[in-house]
């Protein structure tokens, strides 16, 4: 059974995560964001299920994705740059799900815009943590 | 379906530069990134770039940073790879090869390939 | 750099016997790395992506499959034009980098 020292580390990764991804909308739905259109054509594949820890495979998965999607963005909309952010993120998702379990993603058919994959994921942060709390 | 077609084989002194060139058919260049690599006689594959022709931004291999330049011409669909100061180890096939995130997830893998083109360094 | 490490370098089986072929990485990629068959002369060509994906118009003999980071592809009944040699890429980050390579030849 879990921890209460093992449920907040959990908890407070959970939330590291959601920043991550909150501040990544925020600097993509930026009003000057010229990259805008384009990084709406990338296609984002979503989970057919997210409802535990080990569903975050399917977010690793599409975490290349979302690098290069980034690199299209201007440096200033975010705090850090691509790579650094991809990296924090790949850290904390891998702690989260663990790297031993190889948990075999199930995408939905209908594939997602980058505004849709990233409020996917961050509903999945928010509910988790509602969980835990 | 996509096609990948590269030009010539070339014969270089060492010191010189070649400039590869790779055309894209049955779809615009844009919605690639087009990677190049490169394979020396009964060796192995090596990365050595990509550029997004879309913005012209590119990423290279640290092996190769100041010696290699990648370009694209949107208006011909064609990605070119410059390799200047070569040298004999720089004999090799060099393949041009994409990767999209706007279609399959099959394709944001090295799906597509040009047949290569064998440049000779040779005094 | 990431390092994949493939085995055996060579690999001598018949028609019909199974074949297992080994990509072992440096660090951990996730299932971030694809499988390439190439024959001589030619192009490399995807064989499998996603560690355990198979690629449209490759036959279901070919399969992929992920252990932490030791990753296997595997033809489970060799047929005459398999015989060649198979690199394994990953592509979790830049520079991209490829296996050694692993010949399958006939034995």
């Known amino acids: 059974a879990p921890t209460s020292s093992s449920t907040k580390k959990t908890q407070l990764q959970l939330e590291h995560l959601l920043l991550d991804l909150q501040m990544i909308l925020n600097g993509i739905n930026n009003y000057k964001n010229p990259k805008l259109t384009r990084m709406l054509t990338f296609k984002f594949y979503m989970p057919k299920k997210a409802t535990e820890l080990k569903h975050l495979q399917c977010l690793e998965e599409e975490l290349g994705p979302l690098e290069e999607v980034l690199n299209l963005a201007q440096s200033k909309n975010f705090h850090l740059r691509p790579r650094d952010l991809i990296s924090n993120i790949r850290v904390i998702v891998l702690e989260l799900k663990g790297s031993e379990t190889t948990f075999m993603c199930e995408y939905a058919d209908e594939t997602a815009t980058i505004v849709e994959f990233l409020n996917r994921w961050i509903t999945f942060c928010q509910s988790i943590i509602s969980t835990l709390t | 379906q996509v096609q990948l077609v590269q030009s010539g084989a070339e014969v270089k002194k060492p010191g010189a530069t070649v400039k590869i060139s790779c055309k894209v058919s049955?779809?615009?260049?844009?919605?690639?990134?087009m990677h190049w690599v490169r394979q020396a006689p009964g060796q192995g594959l090596e990365w050595i770039g990509r550029i997004d022709p879309d913005d012209d931004s590119t990423k290279y291999a640290e092996n190769f940073k100041g010696r290699v330049t990648i370009t694209a011409d949107t208006s011909t669909d064609t990605a070119y790879m410059e390799l200047s100061s070569l040298r004999s180890e720089d004999t090799a096939v060099y393949y041009c090869t994409t990767i999209t995130f706007l279609y399959s997830r099959e394709l944001r893998w090295f799906a597509y390939w040009g047949q290569g083109t064998l440049v000779t360094v040779s005094s | 750099d990431i390092v994949l490490t493939q085995s055996p370098a060579t690999l001598s089986l018949s028609p019909g016997e199974r074949a297992t072929l080994s990509c072992q990485a440096s660090?951990?990629?996730?299932?971030?790395l694809s499988w390439y068959q190439q024959k001589p002369g030619q192009a490399p060509r995807l064989l499998i992506y996603?560690?355990?994906s198979l690629a449209s118009g490759i036959p279901a003999r070919f399969s992929g499959s992920r252990s932490g980071t030791d990753f296997t592809l595997t033809i489970s009944s060799l047929e005459p034009e398999d015989f060649a040699v198979y690199y394994c890429?990953?592509?979790?980050?830049?520079?991209?980098?490829f296996g050694q390579g692993t010949k399958l030849e006939i034995k």
């Open positions: 049955g779809d615009t260049i844009t919605a690639y990134y």
């Open positions: 996603q560690a355990t």
């Open positions: 890429l990953q592509h979790y980050s830049t520079p991209y980098t």
């Open positions: 660090q951990y990629i996730g299932n971030y």
